[in-house]
């Protein structure tokens, strides 16, 4: 009689996480009598996966009925595979004894687990940045196997090239993580832009996973200011407007100063939105010129999104008015100043010229 051989026909088996893995094993003889055991790994630290003779193995079922006559098939099925199950599995024949002793091992079957990467998470900088600045975005995805993976970056559908990607760990592992950092140059038109991280993996059947970040969370477009004097509304009143254009985000506070003294402060509320996602707003000030003996320097000061204030001034000439109209020597007459603000719809294609 030929000596028993343990046949493991599959050198390797690949299984998707969550599925069952079938590990094939047959013996070539009924002799010697004794049980089959399955181990993961070899040597003294090997892990018992199934013992025909004794033990409780809730995830393991035998493919054939081992009690049946002349059974030589000791293949097993392991349910609900996870990346932690990856490794080399050995089918080992034992010889009956007290205790049973190892008789012969199969050559082993390497089980690899195909695990899907987690949904990519894209995160941007902690603080907003202005156009022309370069900002970094990170993309992370975890838990995938095998290690081979492809990551791409896009901005509004255009592939980016300035990025660095690492897959960890470098050595063998049950599962892997990917971390990538991309550099993006902001433009004034990026309020509606998206940065996309796309991950392709064998487990995704050609349907990559995407993570996105909206540049609206990252960009700050500072406003441009224009202060203009409108035609006289009443004999002694001048309407001065401050047009605040192309800003983002909306958080904005405007202060009027007359000769350096605060006249009024207001917060942008009813704004108009431009096609590019930026906002426009207009505020006006009615100045009673008869209340001023000298020329008035009107300043529109804007604090946008907590940044240092920017301002634009306009010199209001009062010398053209008769002196008696300016007989009120008070430097300011706040009662004469009507508060006002208005929506201002900017033409996106218009060029703005600002005059002091």
């Amino acid at each position: 009689e030929e000596e028993l051989q343990v046949i493991q026909p599959d050198k390797s088996v690949s299984v998707a996480a969550g599925e069952s893995a079938i590990l094939h094993c047959t013996v070539t003889s009924l002799i010697p009598v004794g049980p089959i055991q399955w181990f993961r790994g070899a040597g003294p630290a090997r892990e018992l996966i199934y013992n025909q003779k004794e033990g409780h193995f809730p995830r393991v079922t035998t493919v054939s009925e081992s009690t049946k006559r002349e059974n030589m098939d000791f293949s097993i099925s392991i349910s609900n595979i996870t990346p932690a199950d990856a490794g080399t599995y050995y089918c080992v024949k034992f010889r009956k004894g007290s205790p049973d002793t190892e008789f012969k091992s199969g050559a082993g079957t390497e089980l690899s687990v195909r695990a899907k990467p987690s949904a990519p998470v894209v995160s941007g900088p902690a603080a907003r940045a202005t156009p022309q600045h370069t900002v970094s975005f990170t993309c992370e995805s975890h838990g995938f196997s095998p290690r081979d993976i492809t990551l791409k970056w896009f901005k509004n559908g255009n592939e980016l090239s300035d990025f660095q990607t690492n897959v960890d760990p470098v050595g063998e592992s049950v599962s892997y993580s990917i971390h990538s950092t991309a550099k993006v140059v902001l433009t004034r038109e990026d309020v509606h832009s998206q940065v996309i991280c796309e991950v392709a993996h064998v487990t995704l059947q050609g349907d990559p996973l995407r993570g996105t970040a909206n540049l609206s969370e990252t960009i700050r477009v500072p406003p441009t200011l224009e202060v203009t004097q409108q035609p006289v509304r009443a004999e002694n009143q001048v309407n001065v407007t401050c047009q605040v254009r192309k800003f983002y985000p909306q958080r904005l506070q405007l202060t009027w100063l007359e000769n350096g003294n605060v006249s009024r402060t207001e917060t942008a509320s009813t704004v108009t939105e431009n096609k590019d996602g930026t906002y426009n707003w207009m505020s006006w000030l009615l100045v009673n010129v008869s209340a001023h003996r000298d020329d008035v320097k009107l300043t529109c000061q804007v604090e946008h999104d907590g940044q240092p204030a920017v301002s634009k001034s306009h010199d209001l000439k009062v010398s053209a008015h008769p002196k008696e109209q300016g007989s009120n020597t008070a430097a300011e007459n706040t009662g004469s100043n009507e508060r006002g603000s208005s929506d201002y719809k900017d033409d996106d294609d218009k060029h703005h010229h600002h005059h002091h």
């Epitope: 009598v33 003779k53 004794e54 081992s66 009956k96």
Partner: antibody, heavy 119, light 110 residues
């Protein structure tokens, strides 16, 4: 270590029934056949029947088919052999034995249960 | 059913001598290249003990003075050098079909 522990001796009257138990330990009960064999005083071995605890498949010696019933309780790893309509010639030691190689052989044996049938 | 006939019914052998017990089946007990014959030893007051399986394979813990041979319908259990502890009744069993036992052979010391 495989162990088969059988229930104690029984004395029965003719026509009665007896149910002998065999509690298994040291192995996975559902993975191996259990055989029942009897031996009358001074006589040879006589195979009664066998049962696969995994699915309760049974094979009976035709001589005992109408009088013997094998069952198992997998929750307690116990096999049972019930013999009905006892006669005096059923007096014997009844053994359970485990088949370790699925060869329909008897690798490990219990110590036996003496059943005496006497009026 | 397959009937097994052992011979002799009893046997007396001197210590250190060879003892041979035969078992003949009423039809072949061979299947898939295996001979489904088993040999057991039973000492007084004890359950039987498996010695040989599939005609010629020594069970674990059995001294190598015991051996089995044969094929088809004729089988032999041999004790190469009889020891005092070998005194017992020996049974052959077949399982080509459902198990049956031979009638037993009583081995004594001469």
């Amino acid at each position: 270590q495989v162990q088969l522990v059988q229930s104690g001796a029984e004395v029965k009257k003719p026509g009665a029934s007896v149910k002998v138990s065999c509690k298994a330990s040291g192995y996975t009960f559902t993975n191996y056949w259990i055989n029942w064999v009897r031996q009358a005083p001074g006589q040879g071995l006589e195979w009664i029947a066998m049962i696969d605890p995994s699915d309760s498949e049974t094979h009976y010696n035709q001589i005992f088919k109408d009088r013997a019933t094998l069952t198992t309780d997998t929750s307690t790893s116990t096999a049972y052999m019930e013999l009905r309509s006892l006669r005096s010639d059923d007096t014997a030691v009844y053994y359970c034995a485990m088949d370790y190689g699925s060869l329909y052989a008897m690798d490990y044996w219990g110590r036996g249960t003496l059943v005496t049938v006497s009026s | 059913d397959i009937v097994l006939t052992q011979s002799p019914d009893s046997l007396a052998v001197s210590l250190g001598e060879r003892a041979t017990i035969n078992c003949r089946a009423s039809k072949s007990v061979s299947s898939s290249g295996y001979n489904y014959i088993f040999w057991y030893q039973q000492k007084p007051g004890q359950p039987p003990k498996l010695l040989i399986y599939l005609a010629s394979n020594l069970d674990s813990g059995v001294p190598d003075r015991f051996s089995g041979s044969g094929s088809g319908t004729d089988f032999t259990l041999t004790i190469s050098s009889l020891q005092a502890e070998d005194v017992a009744v020996y049974y052959c069993q077949e399982s080509r079909e459902l198990p049956t036992f031979g009638q037993g052979t009583k081995l004594e010391i001469k």
